[in-house]
């Protein structure tokens, strides 16, 4: 799998999309996980609804949301209020039983907020030891949530 780079601005929301063959993965739940080291396990961050038919409902874990367009074949992950520690390598996964197929490898890069004049020294970029030669960069145009905006539908 090639790695796709998504760049977002600190403090804003970053949307990551993972396209897939909807027939190949029909009926399968999806997940977003964070790669722990180059060869380490992929630690689950959030997964789609337990009932596959309800995969379109947005599920949150902390500041990370996931939703699945099972007909169109696009998994969408939203990282809200992006922080430097969110930078790193992730995977979109398709689940079947206890197995997980990788849909896409994603490198999240966090860029300094141009309006924030604090020291950007703690922002993460891949170092020389983490070169992604065939990485494809996607700039995600995102915005911060407006004041009072509800990030998920009310439960009533």
């Amino acid at each position: 799998h090639n790695t796709t780079v998504f760049q977002g601005v600190a403090g804003q929301s970053l949307q990551v999309s993972c396209p897939y063959d909807s027939m190949k993965h029909w009926g399968r739940r999806k997940a977003w996980c964070r790669q722990l080291g180059e060869k380490g396990p992929c630690q689950r961050v959030v997964s789609t609804h337990n009932l596959w038919l309800l995969s379109f409902l947005r599920r949150w874990n902390g500041s990370t949301a996931i939703t699945d367009d099972t007909l169109g074949g696009t998994l969408t992950i939203t990282l809200r209020n992006l922080q430097p520690h969110d930078a790193g390598l992730y995977q979109c996964q398709s689940l079947h039983g206890s197995e997980a197929d990788t849909l896409r490898k994603v490198l999240v890069e966090v860029l300094a907020d141009p309006l924030d004049h604090r020291d950007a020294g703690d922002l993460w970029f891949p170092g020389e030891s983490e070169s992604f030669e065939d990485a494809h960069v996607e700039h995600s145009i995102s915005r911060s949530l407006l004041e009072g905006e509800i990030p998920f539908p009310p439960t009533s």
Epitope: M23, K24, W26, R28, N50, H96
Partner: antibody
Framework: EVQLVQSGSEVKKPGESLRISCKGS????????LAWVRQMPGKGLEWMGI????????RYSPSFQGQVTISADKSISTAYLQWSSLKASDTAMYYC???????????WGQGTLVTVSS | DIVMTQTPLSLPVTPGETASISCRSS????????????LDWYLQKPGQSPQLLIY???YRASGVPDRFSGSGSGTDFTLKISRVEAEDVGVYYC?????????FGGGTKVEIK
């Protein structure tokens, strides 16, 4: 009507190569997983592996990895099971089966009997 | 690999009676997250290819009579055939698909007394 039609019986000698086929019809061949299952004489079923013809994504059971090759040609809606050097222990009935993405098998071919004997 | 063990090996039944086949897995087939149990049942009638009877523990495949039912939890499973008919004879296999490689039980041969 969904159909999986397998190639006819084969009698081969040890060391020979062989490719058997499974032709799908009545559905979009590219869009469904297709598995191969072995049944040795008088024995049970063994899952060999599975392929998604749309992109040729293939998974093998460790017991069969390196022993056989699973492939598909979506242009002619046909999947293949291939041996480069047959052994007497390869004598069996081989079934192809159409799977869902969750890997249960709703349609089966009629089977191909492979006999390997010197 | 997950080992699937079926009992009995052979089951003689009288038409109209209920037959029960057991299947045990070496580890749990329950996905605790989605609540599904990844256990299926297949029937291979004499001289025929296998056919799907039950998938995901208890869902009947299309065209399968309601005389067939699957149940169980975790590692112990049962296929029940109520009001057994002559056409039900054959070898019944359980199969797990919670992890690769998919594995089948050794089979239970159902025959009419």
């Amino acid at each position: 009507e969904v159909q999986l039609v397998q190639s006819g019986s084969e009698v081969k000698k040890p060391g020979e190569s062989l490719r058997i086929s499974c032709k799908g019809s009545g559905y979009s061949f590219s869009s469904y997983w297709l598995a191969w299952v072995r049944q040795m004489p008088g024995k049970g079923l063994e899952w060999m592996g599975i392929i998604y013809p749309g992109d040729s994504d293939t998974r093998y059971s460790p017991s069969f990895q390196g022993q056989v090759t699973i492939s598909a040609d979506k242009s002619i809606s046909t999947a293949y099971l291939q041996w480069s050097s047959l052994k007497a222990s390869d004598t069996a009935m081989y079934y192809c089966a159409r799977g869902t993405p969750l890997f249960y098998f709703t349609y089966w071919g009629q089977g191909t009997l492979v006999t390997v004997s010197s | 690999d997950i080992v699937m063990t079926q009992t009995p090996l052979s089951l003689p039944v009288t038409p109209g009676e209920t037959a029960s086949i057991s299947c045990r897995s070496s580890q749990s087939l329950l996905d605790s997250e989605d609540g599904n149990t990844y256990l299926d049942w297949y029937l291979q009638k004499p001289g025929q290819s296998p056919q799907l009877l039950i998938y995901t523990l208890s869902y009947r495949a299309s065209g399968v009579p309601d005389r067939f039912s699957g149940s169980g939890s975790g590692t112990d499973f049962t296929l029940k055939i109520s009001r057994v008919e002559a056409e039900d004879v054959g070898v019944y296999y359980c199969m797990q698909r919670i992890e690769s490689p998919l594995t089948f039980g050794g089979g239970t041969k159902v025959e009419i007394k």
